[in-house]
Interface confidence: low
């Protein structure tokens, strides 16, 4: 942290004789500069130079060869790197007076005669005398106005709207300023700034429109920053709305946008009379042409349980707005004939959500579903296959005799989705088959017994078990199972000898 620069002469203020020369020296631990009352055009007789010395400090000298009333004012020495537009200069000050019997008041620019008052705030009428000893009075149409005076600043007070004149007497001679006009403007201590972009996504050739509105404030400076600024692409407009309250609406229009106009559009409002600043930003994207992106939140193969309620949600990003439709097996989905509904909702400017809802899933709801999104520039689709999962059930369990050989085949037909597995079990002691422990799983590698499975279609399967010879009555169980459930049926196989005895009997 650098300590403040120092000034020689080491005084707060100094009175300099008219037409004489004076110099101010500034010493600092880093490079220093001077700020002084005149503008650069008026300062031909002000010279600033750097001076070498052995102290190790940086020294900058300000020299005035012939002092005039215009040189009256505040001289500030500051470190170069500390100067910012927003902040008041931080440095060391000295106020110089150059009394001139013919010039009672320091000359001002025309804008200084316009005094803006915010509501009932105090204001300064900046008539400054060239001599600190000169008595000054303030007048308006009603006479002398009581207000505190400081020769470095002017009259400070709460003023009503209208013209004011400063009057001074120097060596018996009366001097008057031209009128200072006091205007009252609506201004708040905080800036209420709102930005609006009806669209943030555009195509080439379209016109970008962004607005910023300032509420209850007339003392505002608003600046736009945007990608096409350097090319002067933007057309700015200000609309003042007085009713029901004060509102300044700034509009930036960028016609015939191109991809290069994509980026941040920023409005920065600054209150002209206070160091209050507010910024708002919106990101605009310009696309060469329209687009569609489909983002499903599910896979290309989905399963639904029988009678289940299920929603399939697809997120769509598109510009211009898309038309969204659903197909089943490449045919338009006719919703009123099924317990399937679809809807589309707009979530954000270019984001849409389409939902396919199965109310109570049925077997016939299985199939390929396609969402199609299209606009004038693009068409995109997404297809997924839906399988309705059905618990396994046994359709048929029959046996088939092989005549005199004594062999028998049992066929078990089952259906379900996913395709059921078929398992065979056998109970050899017919009297004990009510007891689950009497049943054993039929292994594939048992001699004299052959098991095989054939799938008939996507949801039907047939299992066969062939017994080379059935010598005594046995029970055979077919067990069909899938993820959703299992079913079993049993069949009694009678040995051919027993069967013939029964037939004879």
């Amino acid at each position: 942290q650098l300590s403040l620069p120092s000034i020689l002469p080491n005084e707060n203020e100094k009175v300099v004789q008219l037409n004489s020369s004076f110099s101010l020296r500034c010493f600092g631990e880093s490079e220093v500069s001077w700020q002084y009352p005149m503008s650069e055009e008026e300062s031909s007789d002000v010279e600033i130079r750097n001076e070498e010395n052995n102290s190790g400090l940086f020294v900058t000298v300000l020299e005035v060869s012939s002092a005039s009333a215009a040189h009256t004012g505040l001289y500030t020495c500051y470190y170069n790197h500390t100067q910012t537009e927003e902040n008041e200069l931080e440095g060391r000050h000295i106020y110089i007076y150059v009394p001139d019997p013919d010039v009672a008041f320091v000359p001002l620019g025309m804008t200084d005669y316009l005094v803006i008052v915010e509501d009932d705030d105090s204001a300064i009428i900046p008539c400054r005398t060239t001599d600190p000893e000169t008595p000054v009075t303030l007048h308006n149409s009603e006479g002398v106005v009581p207000a505190s005076y400081d020769s470095r600043q002017g009259f400070n007070g709460t003023f009503t709207v209208g013209p004011y004149i400063c009057e001074a007497t120097v060596k018996g001679k009366k001097f008057q300023t031209i009128p200072f006009n006091v205007y009252a403007l609506k201004a708040t201590s905080e800036l209420d700034l709102e930005m609006e972009a009806l669209k943030t996504v555009y195509k080439s050739g379209e016109t970008i429109v962004v607005t910023c509105a300032v509420f209850n404030n007339e003392v505002v400076d608003l600046q736009w920053t945007y990608p096409g600024e350097v090319k002067g692409k933007g057309i700015t407009m200000l609309e003042e709305i007085k009713v029901p309250s004060i509102k300044l609406v700034y509009t930036l229009t960028v016609p015939e946008a191109t991809v290069k106009d994509s980026g941040d559009y920023e409005c920065a409002a600054r209150q002209a009379t206070r160091e209050v600043k507010e910024m708002k930003k919106v990101t605009i994207s310009v696309h060469e042409k329209g687009f569609i992106e489909i983002k499903p939140t599910f896979s290309q193969l989905e399963a639904v349980n029988l009678h289940e309620v299920k929603h399939f949600v697809v997120e769509v990003r598109a510009y211009p707005p898309p038309r969204i439709s659903w197909l089943k097996n490449n045919l338009t989905l006719i919703e009123n004939l099924t317990e399937i509904t679809t809807d589309v909702e707009k979530i954000q400017e270019i984001r849409y959500r389409s939902k396919l809802k199965l109310i109570r899933a049925k077997e016939e709801d299985s199939g390929h579903y396609t969402i199609v999104a299209q606009n004038e520039d693009a068409v995109k689709s997404y297809t997924f296959e839906l399988l309705t999962q059905v618990p396994s059930s046994i359709l048929d369990l029959v046996d088939d005799h092989h005549g005199s050989t004594g062999g028998q085949t049992v066929r078990c037909t089952a259906e379900g989705t996913p395709l059921p597995d078929i398992e065979w079990m056998i109970c050899k002691d017919i009297k004990k088959c009510n007891n689950e422990t009497s049943w054993t799983i039929l292994a594939n590698n048992v001699s004299n017994i052959i098991t095989e499975i054939h799938s008939r279609d996507r949801s039907t399967v047939e299992g066969r078990v062939t017994f080379a010879k059935v010598e005594e009555t046995i029970a055979v169980r077919c067990l069909a199972k899938n993820l959703l459930g299992a079913e079993n049926r049993e069949l009694k196989l009678v040995a051919p000898t027993l069967r013939s005895e029964l037939t004879v009997a």
């Epitope: 599910f298 989905e302 949600v313």
Partner: antibody, heavy 120, light 108 residues
């Protein structure tokens, strides 16, 4: 901004009742499914109950079935949980949570929670 | 009911590390899994939905993957604010909606 605020928690004796409320703001409440989730001290998250946007579909966890009742008043942007026959094991922080409009139904907005203590 | 088993139940790591948390479901399904982060005394926050979709406003160092029975939450480069408890949740088969038991991520 989108917000859920629970209230109604407190200390209650076993067998007693409490009614929790959840006030929603910043979004169209009637468009969203809602849930109650609880978290016992030092434990993980446990789903308690679900209600569809219109209130036509309601689910409960087995642990609260028959004792808790979920309801909603879309006109008042409010979700409720009536808790009867409270037990010590119902002691927890209770959160209301919004189901996101996404297939996976992630709970994208949560309240800050309200504490229920069941103790004699 | 579908059970969700998270592993590990706790994990120590350093800032900048890559960490992964796994969630195993007792039944196979596609995508219907969400991941949450919870800090002490706070409500859970949705990080990932539909197994791999990043919730708005969540840093891109978080990612989700997996299908079937095994799902993973990854944090590519741990930041100090990532130390918390993480939960997986399934909404494939409801009711009930079930959560994993949680993974506590601590600073090493």
């Amino acid at each position: 901004q989108v917000q859920l605020v629970e209230s109604g928690g407190g200390l209650v004796k076993p067998g007693g009742s409490l009614r929790l409320s959840c006030a929603a703001s910043g979004f169209t409440f009637s468009d969203y499914y809602m849930n109650w989730i609880r978290q016992a001290p030092g434990k993980g998250l446990e789903w308690v109950s679900f209600i569809s946007s219109s209130g036509s579909t309601i689910y409960y966890a087995d642990s609260v079935k028959g004792r808790f009742t979920i309801s909603r008043d879309n006109a008042k942007n409010s979700l409720y949980l009536q808790m009867n026959s409270l037990r010590a094991e119902d002691t927890a922080v209770y959160y209301c949570a919004r189901d996101g409009h996404i297939a996976a139904r992630g709970m994208d907005v949560w309240g800050q929670g309200t504490t229920v203590t069941v103790s004699s | 009911d579908i059970q969700m088993t998270q592993s590990p139940s706790s994990l120590s790591a350093s800032v900048g590390d890559r960490v992964t948390i796994t969630c195993r479901a007792s039944q196979s399904f596609s995508r219907y899994i969400n991941w949450y982060q919870q800090k002490p005394g706070k409500a859970p926050k949705l990080l990932i939905y539909a197994a791999s979709s990043l919730q708005g406003g969540v840093p891109s160092r978080f990612s989700g993957s997996g299908s079937g029975t095994d799902f993973t939450l990854a944090i590519s480069s741990l930041q100090p604010e990532d130390f918390a408890t993480y939960y997986c949740q399934q909404t494939y088969s409801t009711p009930p909606i079930t959560f994993g038991q949680g993974t506590r991520l601590e600073i090493k």
